[in-house]
């Protein structure tokens, strides 16, 4: 059930889940100068019953200059600097994304934890597509990806995003509107992300996180 | 079955100009973006541009100065490609060409045949 | 605008035989880079994406690599339908930008 591949990459783009399904593993990743605590887990993991999902386990990790001790070393002003830019990049999250059944939310950030984040998705596992920063989107279609079993075999569905820099010789006619109502594309299958202009999601995403964090990968 | 059907061959002037329409069925015309690509006859391809089905946006190459226009019509999930001043080095095989699947330009027309000649 | 340098021009080889054909660009492309190869009086066909994934139904003698500014596309033993002209497209950076082609004869 975990997903074998890897979401598509778009060029100038990058990708988030909203929710975690249950079965998804979360790594123990620490930055640069720590480690695990010897006896912590490997992985967080998304469990839950029918009316409550959460992460069982709890990263931890300490100075790898630490030995026999879980006691957490102060960061200096510079990771200090770096963890608040964490706390700033908790995603957005919409309501009926996170609190939806058999999903958990984004996990709070741990202590000293990687700059990147290293997930194992499972099969029905969607995640959304925006435009990095400097970028808006020239092309639209349904901007996320959803992880399917398909003759035995996952794969990730392709997101119709086409991301062009802001500079670039472009026609944009007007604001993220189509031509005619796409019919073939309900509400209920759109992602949260394009009922609002481009930059109108740039800003707000912008405000609350970096390309870093919501570059995702996983193996 | 994904399919893009193109208009038929033209022979133009110089200075004239030609619409080429794609016509798309197999999947929701609004959800992929829509490219012109140009062959010359012996030569190599050029990408001349794309269009979001979506919402009109577009990107042209500067190669072609200005000279085309790719607009698309929601109503009949058409695509068209407008070139003009057209001049003897503009006659080419232009294809359109959408991506569908996992990667860029997997489905195509077959190809429509401009001659420009006085 | 990423120019995209194909080589060699043209090759000639024997069915069985391995090739590789190469592809450099201008600056860094991030591996958004597909392979295609197109027969006369065809549309071209889609082989590889993102420098080295195989797209469906592709035979398996078909492969891409690379990263950053130089590529490959090798056919591990070449058959006789293979024979064409292949392109290689970056497709990071608008405009889109081909190879000039590389055409595959048989000797």
């Known amino acids: 059930e975990l997903c074998d591949d890897d979401p598509p990459e778009i060029p100038h783009a990058t990708f988030k889940a909203m929710a975690y399904k249950e079965g998804t593993m979360l790594n123990c990743e620490c930055k640069r100068g720590f480690r695990r605590i010897k006896s912590g887990s490997l992985y967080m993991l998304c469990t839950g019953n029918s009316s409550h999902s959460s992460w069982d386990n709890q990263c931890q990790c300490t100075s790898s200059a630490t030995r026999n001790t879980t006691k957490q070393v102060t960061p200096q002003p510079e990771e200090q600097k770096e963890r608040k830019t964490t706390e700033m990049q908790s995603p957005m999250q919409p309501v009926d994304q996170a609190s939806l059944p058999g999903h958990c939310r984004e996990p709070p950030p741990w202590e000293n934890e990687a700059t990147e984040r290293i997930y194992h998705f499972v099969v029905g596992q969607m995640v959304y597509y925006q435009c990095v920063q400097g970028y808006r989107a020239l092309h639209r279609g349904p901007a996320e990806s959803v992880c399917k079993m398909t003759h035995g075999k996952t794969r990730w569905t392709q997101p119709q995003l086409i991301c062009t820099g802001e500079m670039e010789t472009s026609q944009f006619p007007g604001e993220e509107k189509p031509q005619a109502s796409p019919e073939g594309r309900p509400e209920s299958e759109t992602s949260c992300l394009v009922t609002t202009t481009d930059f109108q999601i740039q800003t707000e995403m912008a405000a609350t996180m970096e390309t870093s964090i919501f570059t995702t990968e996983y193996q | 079955e994904v399919q893009l059907v193109q208009s038929g061959a033209e022979v133009k002037k110089p200075g004239a100009t030609v619409k080429i329409s794609c016509k798309v069925s197999?999947?929701?015309?609004?959800?992929?973006?829509m490219h012109w690509v140009q062959q010359a006859p012996g030569k190599g391809l050029e990408w001349m541009g794309v269009i979001s089905t979506y919402n009109g946006n577009t990107n042209y190459n500067q190669k072609f100065k200005g000279r085309v226009t790719i607009t698309a019509d929601t109503s009949t999930d058409t695509a068209y490609m407008e070139l003009s001043s057209l001049r003897s080095e503009d006659t080419a095989v232009y294809y359109c060409?959408?991506?569908?699947?996992?990667?860029?330009?997997?489905?195509w027309g077959q190809g429509t045949l401009v001659t420009v000649s006085s | 605008d990423i120019q995209m340098t194909q080589s060699p021009s043209s090759l000639s080889a024997s069915v069985g035989d391995r090739v590789t054909i190469t592809c450099k660009a201008s600056?860094?492309?991030?591996?958004?880079l597909s392979w295609f190869q197109q027969k006369p009086g065809k549309a071209p066909k889609s082989l590889i994406y993102?420098?080295?994934r195989l797209v469906d139904g592709v035979p398996s003698r078909f492969s891409g690599s690379g990263s950053g500014t130089d590529f490959t596309l090798t056919i591990s033993s070449l058959q006789p339908e293979d024979f064409a002209t292949y392109y290689c497209?970056?497709?990071?950076?608008?405009?889109?930008?081909f190879g000039q082609g590389t055409k595959l004869e048989i000797k």
């Open positions: 993102r420098a080295n």
């Open positions: 497209l970056q497709y990071d950076e608008f405009p889109y930008t």
């Open positions: 197999g999947y929701t015309f609004t959800d992929y973006a």
């Open positions: 600056q860094d492309i991030n591996s958004y």
């Open positions: 060409a959408t991506s569908y699947g996992n990667y860029p330009f997997d489905y």
